[in-house]
């Protein structure tokens, strides 16, 4: 036997109070899918949440942050302060990056210089609060009559043709 | 896409009335109508709205004056007994969207209704 | 409903002049609110939404701005085209003393 509820739309409810009809969900409520037993409250974006996308008889309110804050989590859960680049969040507030550190972004952690001699590289570039350090040719490369190597050509993807 | 009122008329106090706005070009299932009066020489009110979804929702002070009804292609506006206080010109308007926190951008050119013995 | 009061109920100013519009909302409606003009035998035109959202065609002389219960219209470089009534309307669906879409009382603009 087919339950009579499936046949009510999004943006209605299945209303037990009434015999099972499909009601019109009230205003500040919505139902995304058919044959719901109930409305879904709006989301509300108050505070340092703003609304990105208003609530309907169909789909929930969709938030982002006020100027000064990012979204973190799914559905943008909560809004953290923006940084300046060369700084990180802590519980104090925004802090430098300390020394042999970067953040390049307005949020993020700070996150220490490449060490380009893992790699067998020199520093071309002194890494800085807001960059990371440019990694050069290793020191051998540099010496008097080290070969100049000129390197492959990249790869293109299959499918792309040269612009 | 439009809207068009009719139906406003010279009625006696007391006998029904019922307004129809007509929309074409635009489907009622996407968009909220609101109904909207004007005395002579007086401001906007807000008699009540139908929602997207068929929701209708009328102001306070309407307290049964008024019905709101919706079919795939009219909304009606009956004034269920009428009085002189009734008489004005009928503003029907679509939303601009199908948010309930919509507002109104395509308004219809009134129908007028005078309540008179 | 919410209540809607709009001030002044009439104001003059010279072409080339600025008019300030004041909307004040009996409870707090975040940004939801819309300006209309009217013209007498016309319905009423959409110039602004969501506070301070210049609608679709509206000259940039038109500038909206508030939010909460205080709301403002301003009409800079007054032109003749301008003489009309100006409404205020809330939009702001779910308050706590239940939907609506009220007006404000309207400010008749005389262009001299």
């Known amino acids: 036997l087919q339950d009579p509820c499936s046949n009510c739309p999004a943006g209605t409810f299945c209303d037990n109070n009434r015999n099972q009809i499909c009601s019109p969900c009230p205003p500040n409520s919505f139902s995304s899918a058919g044959g719901q037993r109930t409305c879904d409250i709006c989301r509300q974006c108050k505070g340092v949440f703003r609304t990105r996308k208003e609530c309907s008889s169909t789909s929930n309110a969709e938030c982002d942050c006020t100027p000064g804050f990012h979204c973190l989590g799914a559905g943008c859960s909560m809004c953290e302060q923006d940084c300046k680049q060369g700084q990180e969040l802590t519980k104090e507030g925004c802090k430098d990056c300390s020394f042999g550190t970067f953040n390049d972004e307005e949020h993020g952690v700070c996150r220490p210089w490449t060490d380009c001699s893992l790699d067998g590289k020199s520093v071309l570039v002194n890494g800085t609060k807001e960059r990371d350090v440019v990694c050069g040719p290793s020191p051998a490369d540099l010496s008097p009559g080290a070969s100049s190597v000129t390197p492959p050509a990249p790869a293109r993807e299959p499918g792309h043709s040269p612009q | 896409q439009s809207v068009e009122e009719s139906g406003g008329r010279l009625v006696t106090p007391g006998t029904p009335l019922t307004l129809t706005c007509t929309v074409s070009g635009f489907s009622l299932s996407t968009y909220a109508m609101i109904w909207v009066r004007q005395a002579p020489g007086k401001g906007l009110e807000w008699i009540g709205v139908v929602y997207d979804n068929g929701y209708i929702s009328h102001a306070t002070w309407v307290k049964g004056r008024f019905t709101i009804s919706k079919t795939s292609t009219t909304v009606g506006l009956e004034i269920t007994s009428p009085t002189t206080e009734d008489t004005a010109t009928y503003f029907c308007a679509r939303s601009a969207d199908g948010s309930w926190s919509t507002y109104f951008n395509l308004w219809g050119q009134g129908t007028l209704v005078t309540v008179s013995s | 409903d919410i209540v809607m009061t709009q001030t002044p109920a009439s104001v003059e100013a010279a072409v080339g002049g600025t008019v300030t519009i004041k909307c004040q909302a009996s409870?707090?409606?975040?940004?939801?609110l819309a300006w209309y003009q009217q013209k007498p035998g016309q319905p009423p035109k959409l110039l602004i939404y969501k506070a301070s959202t210049l609608a679709s065609g509206v000259s940039s002389r038109f500038k909206g701005s508030g939010s909460g219960t205080e709301f403002t219209l301003t009409i800079s470089d007054l032109e003749s085209a301008d003489a009309a009534t100006y409404y205020c309307?809330?939009?702001?669906?779910?308050?706590?003393?239940?939907?609506?879409?009220?007006f404000g009382g309207g400010t008749e603009v005389v262009v001299k």
């Open positions: 409870e707090s409606i975040s940004n939801y």
């Open positions: 309307q809330t939009n702001y669906c779910c308050s706590s003393s239940d939907n609506g879409f009220a």
